[in-house]
């Protein structure tokens, strides 16, 4: 059925009306408009746009706009004891120290409150000692210097550079190294795209450039006082020692100049392959220690920044649905930013006003969706996803008996060469058959498909003539939603033709040279790319909130659980010999799957054949479309990670950003080969088996006929 | 880490026949796909035939449909290829892959680490 059908609406107000009602010239206004001044968390000017987005939205025509607001712990610097590093002689003079702030660009010279680079919660302290080089930081980084290498981090400064994972899971790394301090720098090898010129002529990260971000190991949890439940006024909140997911050592950004003075002296041992060196002309060295000449010198970090229980605000529009008021749909992206936000958030928070413009203006004209519409601008999303965590935590009950489906809205570009979509297997359909209606923004495909343009330069590694559509995984404002309450979720925006650097970012990502000119001169002059992801968040909004059985294919579903436990067998079965002395089967898992397979296959026929007429039938099966994400939720969640409660689902334990299929099963099997009680190791296998096949089995059950 | 092995290759006349085997010692039980592959000089890569090794299905590439059979014998862990009826132009090297999977009718795409392949064996026949 078309969406125009859902409602009693003339033909006008369809899918095509919202869509052309779209507009590039406003995308880009209110991009202007929202990049002007820095919208910390926590701060005045912060709460000033809360308001401005909460008026405007009302003016758009929403039911209703509401400021939610908790108090949450945040992280600033110390603005009278700056943070910085230096290099120490055998006297303890400071012989070099690094920068205290970015150059501003042009423009912004007299912009006041851009706070300086800072590794947000980073604990105080002035560790000094030797240096040692330990690459990205990632889990098989430490795995090769402490295994291979025999090189011990034990009371070591240890500095990384940025990019393939999650920054907190290098911090939290280096801590269980022994590391008692952690630069942090972004390596031009990463961060500088050959041929391309250094902002202000062009996209690339300048010398002087840092990403700032915070250093959390949170796995879900939302404020780190008040794990679990929204931190409200009358919140008990727990002593700073027992807060979720702090840094218990000193950390700190820098950019590549400063961090060449740091590697061009390190001595001890040569990287020990070429994937270990950058682009900066230094040896790589890895260390221990500067090198002869200088092997007297140490590093000396100076960190006084402070946490602070602070309030922030969401924004919580409502278009009240008309058929079903009580299912949900909800679009949120977030609204506070390091610095500008040039591109994080507000190319995301710009399109979302947009699409909140266009349903008004739809609405202003007597239409009204079949569901309810929730629009949200989150706050402290760069603090670790706290305002989208705490209202989650304060609605839980609502959403996830009336959750349908959230749609991410953050940074609308990361590049310009394609299209990028990460969500639940539940919305494959959805995305294929809305790409195919809408047309591609991209030079060379005139006239043709967003889908063709997409499919073309992002080809499915497994499915020919299909696109590329990859696992959530975490890292921002859908992950509550999706990770603890098995809410459907998708994300969608304009990427780079950069696969290697895929958790990387963008080169001035989290810099203060993240403005509206970076987006408006170098990479969407005429906001055709933003159009484009505006159109495909909106339009999947439309369709989840307007169609009259949702648009929800739950084959999909078993097409990658069928991949999934191919994948974690083939894992396990690298243990033959294990296997077989602890009688580890997966037998239970195929049979699940099996299950899984031709249960929703029938319920696919079913959905074809039934009376759409009859409203009881109708809402029976869309519940049972509803719950399919929520049947995958095991209430008592991941070992060690409550919050992370997905059975098929979570964040890798490796890396935040990237998606992990049974994740259970997977952190089990890792490193196994080392575990001091290989007994008790591949116990732990043959449980997450058991979850897991439970799981799939139990989530099949809920699609079979109800009685 | 499992090694394949594989063996059976050899010179034969055109009309003759090789039995080829690939053995994944270790394998503890039926559930992988098990292929044959060849690679013929200045030519690419291409499959021949495969095993679900769980379900017994087989399949087989349109070059060799007819003349080849591939078996199993799962107690061993072992999977063969008949090959006869032999033509010059099945002259390669023959390589042996295997996928611990249950599901799959082919070797997993876009998943490389998954998939171990064995040294390859020579099959040379001539006219």
């Known amino acids: 059925k078309s969406s125009n059908e859902a409602t009693n609406i003339t033909p006008k107000h369809n899918m095509k009306a919202f869509l052309d009602e779209l507009k590039a010239e406003n995308i880009k206004k209110f991009l202007y408009n929202f990049t002007q001044i820095p919208h910390l968390a926590g701060t005045e000017q912060n709460f000033q746009l809360a308001k401005q987005i909460q008026s405007q939205w009302k003016e758009f025509g929403l039911d209703s706009v509401e400021l939610a607001h908790y108090d949450v712990l945040l992280s600033y610097p110390n603005k009278t004891h700056p943070n910085y590093i230096s290099i120490i002689n055998e006297d303890g003079n400071e012989i070099f120290n690094t920068s205290l702030f970015e150059p501003p660009p042009p423009g912004y010279e007299n912009v006041s409150d851009i706070v300086p680079p800072f590794s947000a919660f980073s604990p105080q302290g002035m560790p000094e000692g030797d240096l040692v080089y330990v690459n990205y930081a990632r889990t098989e980084d430490f795995f090769k210097l402490e295994r291979d290498m025999k090189i011990n981090c034990s009371g070591k400064i240890v500095i990384a550079r940025y990019g393939k994972v999650f920054r907190g899971n290098k911090v939290k790394n280096a801590q269980l190294a022994g590391a008692k301090g952690v630069i942090l720098y972004s390596d031009p090898a990463d961060y500088f795209a050959p041929g391309v010129k250094s902002y202000p002529d062009g996209w690339n990260l300048p010398g002087g450039g840092v990403q700032r971000g915070n250093i959390l190991n949170l796995n879900g949890a939302g404020d780190p006082l008040t794990p679990g439940y929204p931190a409200n006024e009358y919140a008990y909140r727990r002593g700073i020692a027992e807060a979720v997911g702090l840094p218990s050592i000193p950390v700190h950004p820098i950019g590549y100049y400063d961090a060449q003075k740091l590697l061009e002296k390190m001595g001890g041992s040569a990287p020990p392959d070429s994937s270990w060196r950058g682009s900066l002309k230094v040896p790589y060295n890895v260390g221990p220690g500067f090198t002869g000449n200088f092997s007297t010198q140490k590093v000396k970090m100076h960190i006084h920044s402070t946490n602070e229980v602070t309030r922030i605000y969401n924004v919580i529009g409502t278009l009240r649905g008309a058929v079903e008021p009580d299912r949900y749909v909800i679009l949120g992206g977030h609204r506070d930013s390091w610095v500008f936000g040039g591109i994080d958030p507000q190319s995301g928070a710009a399109v979302v006003h947009e699409i909140v413009r266009s349903f008004g203006t739809l609405k202003k004209e007597g239409w009204r969706p079949r569901r309810t519409i929730l629009f949200a601008s989150w706050d402290a999303e760069e603090f670790g996803l706290l305002g989208s965590t705490e209202w989650a935590e304060e609605n839980s009950r609502l959403l996830q008996e009336r959750g349908v489906a959230y749609i991410n809205a953050d940074s609308s570009i990361e590049g310009n060469y394609t299209l990028r979509v990460d969500c639940t297997p539940l919305m494959y359909s959805l995305v294929h058959n809305l790409t195919k209606e809408l047309k591609s923004p991209d030079e060379g495909f005139e006239g043709k498909s967003l889908y063709e343009s997409w499919t073309k330069k992002s080809p499915s590694p497994e499915f020919s003539g299909m696109p590329r559509i990859s696992k959530l995984g975490s890292g921002n404002d859908f992950e509550v939603f999706f990770q603890r309450l098995g809410i459907a979720s998708g994300r969608a925006r304009y990427t780079k033709n950069w696969e290697t650097n895929k958790f990387s970012g963008y080169p001035l990502y989290h810099s203060v040279y993240e403005t509206y000119e970076l987006v408006e001169k170098f990479y969407d002059p005429m906001f055709k790319y933003h159009l484009t992801v505006a159109q495909v968040r909106g339009g999947m909004v439309f369709e989840l909130a307007n169609s009259i059985v949702l648009p929800f294919d739950c084959r999909d579903y078993a097409v990658v659980l069928r991949k999934y436990a191919d994948k974690i067998y083939s894992i396990s079965m690298k243990h033959p010999q294990e296997m077989k002395t602890y009688s580890v089967s997966f037998d239970s898992l195929f049979s699940a799957v099996k299950n899984f397979t031709e249960i929703a296959s029938k319920f696919s026929e079913r959905l074809q054949d039934f009376d759409k007429s009859n409203p009881i039938v109708l809402r029976m099966m869309n519940d049972q479309l509803m719950f399919l994400e929520r049947a995958f939720i095991d209430p008592l969640g991941l070992p060690d990670r409550p919050f992370y409660r997905h059975v098929i689902y979570a964040p890798s334990s490796h890396n935040k950003y990237a998606g992990e299929s049974f994740p259970g099963i997977y952190d089990a099997l890792f490193d196994i080969e080392s575990k001091v009680d290989p007994s008790k190791a591949w116990g732990e296998v043959k449980r997450q088996i058991y979850v897991a096949a439970f799981t799939v089995q139990a989530a099949a059950e809920t699609l079979s006929e109800v009685a | 880490q499992v090694q394949l092995q594989e063996s059976g290759g050899g010179s034969v006349q055109a009309g003759g026949s090789l039995r080829l085997s690939c053995t994944a010692p270790?394998?503890?039980?039926?559930?992988?796909?098990m292929s044959w592959f060849r690679q013929a000089p200045g030519k690419e890569r291409e499959w021949v035939a495969g095993?679900?090794?769980?379900?017994?299905?087989?399949s087989y590439a349109d070059t060799v449909k007819g003349r080849f059979t591939i078996s199993q014998d799962n107690a061993k862990n072992t999977m063969f290829l008949q090959m006869n009826s032999l033509k010059p132009e099945d002259t390669a090297i023959y390589y042996c892959?295997?996928?611990?999977?249950?599901?799959?009718?082919?070797?997993?795409?876009?998943?490389?680490?998954?998939?171990?392949w064995g040294q390859g064996t020579q099959v040379t026949v001539s006219s």
């Open positions: 095993v679900n090794t769980g379900r017994g299905s087989t």
């Open positions: 892959a295997v996928a611990a999977c249950h599901f799959c009718d082919s070797l997993p795409k876009g998943q490389d680490e998954q998939i171990l």
């Open positions: 270790g394998y503890t039980d039926s559930n992988y796909y």
